[in-house]
């Protein structure tokens, strides 16, 4: 069974998938569509790297541009380094500027909804 066939079979169960499953799925050439991606748990999407999301979406990665202001895409963008986002060539904006350090302060993030940044 190829990645696309596998994805069709599990598609309806993905809404509650944890990060680990999404990371594993990104290695399967599944080409997840944006409708499915947008239904994923935000907390499961946030830890994914740019490379993992690119692999997960395959040719659909271009669709991130059209959804960049909607959750969970918006929240994921805020967690990525802008340099990494730029590698996609989609013009995605709002990533962490080059040279900034991300502090994983869960309380601060829970209150503000955004990661805590320290400048260069």
């Amino acid at each position: 069974m190829n990645g696309s066939e596998y994805f069709v079979k599990i598609q309806s169960f993905l809404g509650g998938a944890p990060t680990e499953d999404l990371k594993a799925l990104s290695q399967q050439n599944v080409s997840m569509d944006l409708a499915t991606f947008m239904k994923l748990r935000t907390d499961a999407v946030l830890p994914l790297t740019v490379a993992e999301v690119q692999k997960l979406l395959g040719p659909h990665v271009e669709g991130l541009k059209a959804e960049e202001r909607h959750r969970p895409v918006r929240d994921w963008i805020l967690r990525q380094r802008q340099d990494d986002l730029d590698t996609l060539g989609l013009g995605l904006q709002g990533g962490i500027p080059n040279g900034y350090l991300v502090l994983d302060l869960s309380m601060q993030e829970a209150l503000s909804g955004t990661p805590c940044l320290l400048g260069p």
Epitope: G63, K65, A66, H70
Partner: antibody, heavy 119, light 106 residues
Framework: EVQLQQSGPELVKPGTSVKILCKAS????????MDWVKQRHGQSLEWIGD????????IYNQKFEGKAILTVDKSSSTAYMELRSLTSEDTAVYYC????????????WGQGTTLTVSS | QIVLTQSPAIMSASPGEKVTMTCSVN?????IYWYQQKPGSSPRLLIH???NLASGVPVRFSGSGSGTSYSLTISRMEAEDAATYYC?????????FGGGTKLEIK
């Protein structure tokens, strides 16, 4: 066949609010964002904002922040746009338009709802 | 915000004639979309992703361009093509439409 059926024309007084509906049929409601577009008589099209039916996430053209409020009812595949504090500037035809998630264009449009604001 | 300038604003063409209208953008965009609107009707998608014909659109319509310059061409004008045509971009927020080109039949 995909259809977006909008509510009928409205004649309302300045300062009031109105809620326009757009009922979708013929396809999976949650695979598409619902966008709203304004067109004043003889003029071009103005994008108001859109809503994602899966998450209720909304984005608005800054010009319409506070003017328009977008909501959806997934159970009836219906999108709503409420327009507040109406003035004569809000007199226009309002369209709902379907946008597939991840795409930048509107492949199906409602027939339009004419809103007239007059005392 | 990105501004789309369509030209000409109004034009007329005879049946069978080739028609070209343009959409100029003040900043580079990835794609342009084209819509047709007839009086009293809703807009209808003609072309997506700059050059792809939407479902049911006659092959006499075509789109091209890149960066800041785009065009819509009708290879042979027909009476039913009389309408106003709008370009639209989704590359930068907020999403905007051009002012339209009104195409009349001679």
């Amino acid at each position: 066949e995909v259809q977006l059926q909008q509510s009928g024309p409205e004649l309302v007084k300045p300062g009031t609010s109105v809620k326009i509906l757009c009922k979708a049929s013929g396809d999976t409601f949650t695979a598409y964002n619902m966008d709203w577009v304004k067109q004043r008589h003889g003029q071009s099209l103005e994008w108001i904002g859109d809503i994602n039916p899966n998450t209720d996430s909304t984005i608005y053209n800054q010009k319409f922040e506070g003017k328009a409020i977008l909501t959806v009812d997934k159970s009836s595949s219906t999108a709503y746009m409420e327009l507040r504090s109406l003035t004569s500037e809000d007199t226009a035809v309002y369209y709902c338009a379907r946008r597939k998630l991840g795409r930048g264009y509107f492949d199906y449009w409602g027939q339009g709802t004419t809103l007239t604001v007059s005392s | 915000q990105i501004v789309l300038t369509q030209s000409p604003a109004i034009m007329s063409a005879s049946p069978g004639e080739k028609v070209t209208m343009t959409c100029s953008v003040n900043l580079s965009v990835r794609y342009i979309y084209w819509y047709q609107q007839k009086p009293g009707s809703s807009p209808r998608l003609l072309i997506h992703d700059t050059s792809n014909l939407a479902s049911g659109v006659p092959v006499r319509f075509s789109g091209s361009g890149s960066g800041t310059s785009y065009s819509l061409t009708i290879s042979r004008m027909e009476a039913e093509d009389a309408a106003t045509y709008y370009c639209q971009q989704w590359s930068s927020f907020p999403y905007t439409f051009g002012g339209g080109t009104k195409l009349e039949i001679k």
